[in-house]
């Protein structure tokens, strides 16, 4: 049997049953999430659930730039350090950079400091690039 790999929307990339869109647009976290949702297919800001997934994403992004942080779908909606993925994925894999989680920083970004392999918390109203994800 021939198994066809699902296709992603133009400009999105495929990895292990998911499509990812890296948007070089400056948006705050909530606007970024709304923009991801606007593409349909159940798209949200991306959850990153393994080192392999993180490495694939990081390699892709590094082909565009190496200095700008990027919003992902991890947030702390209750502002009580109870982090969760906006797409409902289980929060098991963690890759925090070890920076302070204090202050009014309740949204997560991929940090450029470690080639996008680690995360930092940041203020949700910051306007930055963002990564969307959906399952085709």
């Amino acid at each position: 049997d021939i198994i066809m790999r699902p296709s992603c929307a133009p400009g999105w990339f495929y990895h292990k049953s998911n499509c990812y869109g890296y948007f070089r647009k400056l948006r705050n976290w909530s606007d970024a999430e709304l923009e991801c949702q606007s593409y349909g297919n159940g798209a949200h800001l991306a959850s990153i659930l393994s080192l392999k997934e993180a490495s694939t994403i990081a390699e892709y992004i590094s082909g565009y730039q190496r200095s700008q942080p990027i919003w992902i779908g991890l947030h702390d909606p209750q502002k009580r350090q109870q982090w969760q993925w906006i797409d409902g994925a289980m929060y098991l894999y963690r890759s925090w950079s070890g920076k302070s989680m204090g202050g009014n920083k309740h949204c997560a970004e991929m940090s450029s400091n470690n080639n996008f392999l680690t995360w930092s918390s940041n203020e949700c109203n910051k306007r930055q690039h963002f990564l969307c994800k959906y399952r085709p």
Partner: antibody, heavy 121, light 110 residues
Amino acid sequence: EVQLLESGGGLVQPGGSLRLSCAASGFTFSSYAMSWVRQAPGKGLEWVSAISGSGGSTYYADSVKGRFTISRDNSKNTLYLQMNSLRAEDTAVYYCASDSDSSDYYYFDSWGQGTMVTVSS
Amino acid sequence: QSVLTQPPSASGTPGQRVTISCSGSSSNIGFNDVYWYQQLPGLAPKLLIYSNNQRPSGVPDRFSGSESGTSASLAISGLRSEDEADYYCATWDDSLSAPVFGGGTKVTVL
């Protein structure tokens, strides 16, 4: 207040050379990428070239690659465009533009008044 | 021919709302921010809108930007005579690895 002042334009024959300068003030020049953008008479805008704040990275439109060279002297707060092998289609007003709010060098925050380059025999 | 497509002209009477479209593709507007520039007659261009809908200080809120998919638009509400100018959209193009402009739209106030 950001100020950009171009100079060096003029009339030149096809195949000739010209060097444009852009004197910058009102911001920390070395911190920001700079670009040259041109506009042929009665036409739209066309990006020509860009340079990083340090001067270590340069970028060119295909239409000028190999003929134009962008450079900067951060000690003099000045941007340059060396134009060689000029063609009639290079005739345009040349603007220098700064990015003073973003790390993307295609975001032209402030513009100079422009300098006219005419390539004609 | 420009990578981004704009209508060559648009017009309206004072007080009206005028919208200018800018059409691109997934290699430019689809994944990159859109900027709008205003060029008054005989003057250098001026940044009007950045990052889709942000206005630099000094730009009236009559000007607004929006974006959807691979298209963007600039709206001028409460049109005034001093808005008569050329308007250009711009973004980055991933395929060309270069900034690109639309061909420009001349707005006339009737």
